[in-house]
């Protein structure tokens, strides 16, 4: 028996369902009573889901997995993983045994989009050209860790005096806080871009300083 899986990682959004595709080519006369199908975590060999001798043995993985029973006889051994979590990320091995056996691994990459950044200034009043200000760009509930870029009004990257911290919450999602310390010009716009490297999703935030008072562009 030959097992086939997709070579590319499966990308799944947090809280959605993902299908880990796995197939085999049944011989003529094949019946499910001959099939041993096991899905396991590749690294640890921990059982995820199994099907033995015509019987679905159920989910051993927080009761969030399912096979496609009606498609098994056609050689579709795919696994459905429901309500994907950050902790589900990793490699899964599909192990099929009929007379002989074969296995193949498929990777699951979990992702969550970052929120539109919120911008704050400190100090936020009585600002004069030449003052040092701290601009904080905050974006929430993304995965995996973000890439953060700062630019000025002319699109020139600002790389000095930037401190970025990323903290995972109890669900494993990251909150990003990036702080830019800059000396004010007469007026200027400062933009922060938070990029999710897996989703290639960019979230933008900016603040414009035009003398007094400071203005924030309206939410998109």
């Amino acid at each position: 028996v030959e097992v086939q899986v997709s070579e590319d990682p499966v990308v799944a959004l947090v809280d959605t369902d993902a299908t880990l595709r796995c197939s085999f080519s049944p011989e003529p006369g094949f019946s499910l009573a001959q099939l041993n199908l096991i899905w396991q975590l590749t690294d640890t060999k921990q059982l995820v889901h199994s099907f033995t001798e015509g019987r679905d043995q159920g989910s051993a993985y927080s009761n969030r997995t399912a096979l496609f029973p009606d498609l098994l006889v056609q050689g579709n051994a795919s696994l459905r993983l429901q309500r994907v979590r950050v902790t589900d990320e990793g490699s899964y091995t599909c192990f099929v045994s009929i007379q002989d056996f074969d296995s193949a691994a498929v990777s699951l990459q979990v992702a969550a989009p970052y929120s539109k950044p919120s911008m704050t200034l400190e100090p936020n009043k009585d600002l004069r050209p030449g003052n040092m200000v701290t601009i904080t760009c905050s974006s929430y509930q993304g995965y995996p860790e973000a890439e953060v870029f700062w630019k000025d009004g002319q699109g020139v990257p600002l790389t000095g005096n930037v401190t970025t911290s990323q903290m995972a919450n109890e669900r494993g999602l990251f909150d990003v806080h990036s702080v830019l310390r800059v000396v004010l010009g007469a007026n200027g716009t400062y933009s922060c871009l938070v990029r999710n490297p897996v989703l290639q999703q960019d979230a933008h935030g900016s603040v414009t300083i035009t003398g007094q008072p400071l203005t924030f562009p309206p939410e998109a």
Epitope: I38, Q46, L47, T93, F101
Partner: antibody
Framework: QVQLVQSGAEVKKPGESLKISCKAS????????MHWVRQRPGKGLEWIGM????????NYNERFKRKATLTVDKSISTAYLQWSSLKAEDTAMYYC??????????WGQGTLVTVSS | QIVLTQSPSTLSASVGDRVTMTCSAS?????MYWYQQKPGKAPKLLIY???NLASGVPIRFSGSGSGTSYTLTISSMQPDDFVTYYC?????????FGQGTKLEIK
């Protein structure tokens, strides 16, 4: 005919570890889940976990995850239960059992483990 | 985990009696399995998939039920049957057993 023959009785001191064997014959050892179950004196049956020899896949009862390690040696059709840091309350009969579909249809004779200082 | 509660814990009967014991699951299970255990021996599979007799088991044993309620019936008790019986489920992990029903001679 299917046979599961377990290693002999063991007397251990608290804190010691233990390795019990279960030698299978009469069927294709590689293709069937092997379970381990324990029974403390005068008590009921407790499922420890199971292992599939062919793939090496295992599943533990969370309760015993830190205590038990299941392994197999396919070349000699033998399953093993390793138990770490024994306590007096681990005194029990330990059984291996082969399963087909969803039933454990053949059981070993049991290995009596006594933990006493 | 699914908790299986067997009742009664102890049952007194005489040879020839019809005996029924029950196994109640804390949540629905697809199938129930029944084992017989004699003193000092390993458990032996009696009933699989709720109602199917395992190989070599006398037809006086029968099983039934669905959902959360299952029964094992012995139609005519024989001297050999006065031992302990366990139910077991494999509908979810961990696999669990009932606490047992012990049959005693009245």
């Amino acid at each position: 005919q299917v046979q599961l023959v377990q290693s002999g009785a063991e007397v251990k001191k608290p804190g010691e570890s233990l390795k019990i064997s279960c030698k299978a014959s009469g069927y294709n050892f590689n293709n069937y889940w092997m379970h381990w179950v324990r029974q403390r004196p005068g008590k009921g049956l407790e499922w420890i976990g199971m292992i599939h020899p062919n793939s090496g896949t295992f599943n533990y009862n969370e309760r015993f995850k830190r205590k038990a390690t299941l392994t197999v040696d396919k070349s000699i059709s033998t399953a093993y239960l390793q138990w770490s840091s024994l306590k007096a309350e681990d005194t029990a009969m330990y059984y291996c059992a082969k399963s087909t579909a969803l039933a454990t249809d053949y059981w070993g004779q049991g290995t009596l483990v006594t933990v006493s200082s | 985990q699914i908790v299986l509660t067997q009742s009664p814990s102890t049952l007194s009967a005489s040879v020839g009696d019809r005996v029924t014991m029950t196994c109640s699951a804390s949540s629905s299970v697809s199938y129930m399995y029944w084992y017989q255990q004699k003193p000092g021996k390993a458990p032996k599979l009696l009933i699989y998939d709720t109602s199917n007799l395992a190989s070599g088991v006398p037809i006086r044993f029968s099983g039934s039920g669905s959902g959360t309620s299952y029964t094992l019936t012995i139609s005519s008790m024989q001297p050999d049957d006065f031992v302990t019986y366990y139910c077991q489920q494999w509908s979810s992990y961990p696999l669990t057993f009932g606490q047992g029903t012990k049959l005693e001679i009245k």
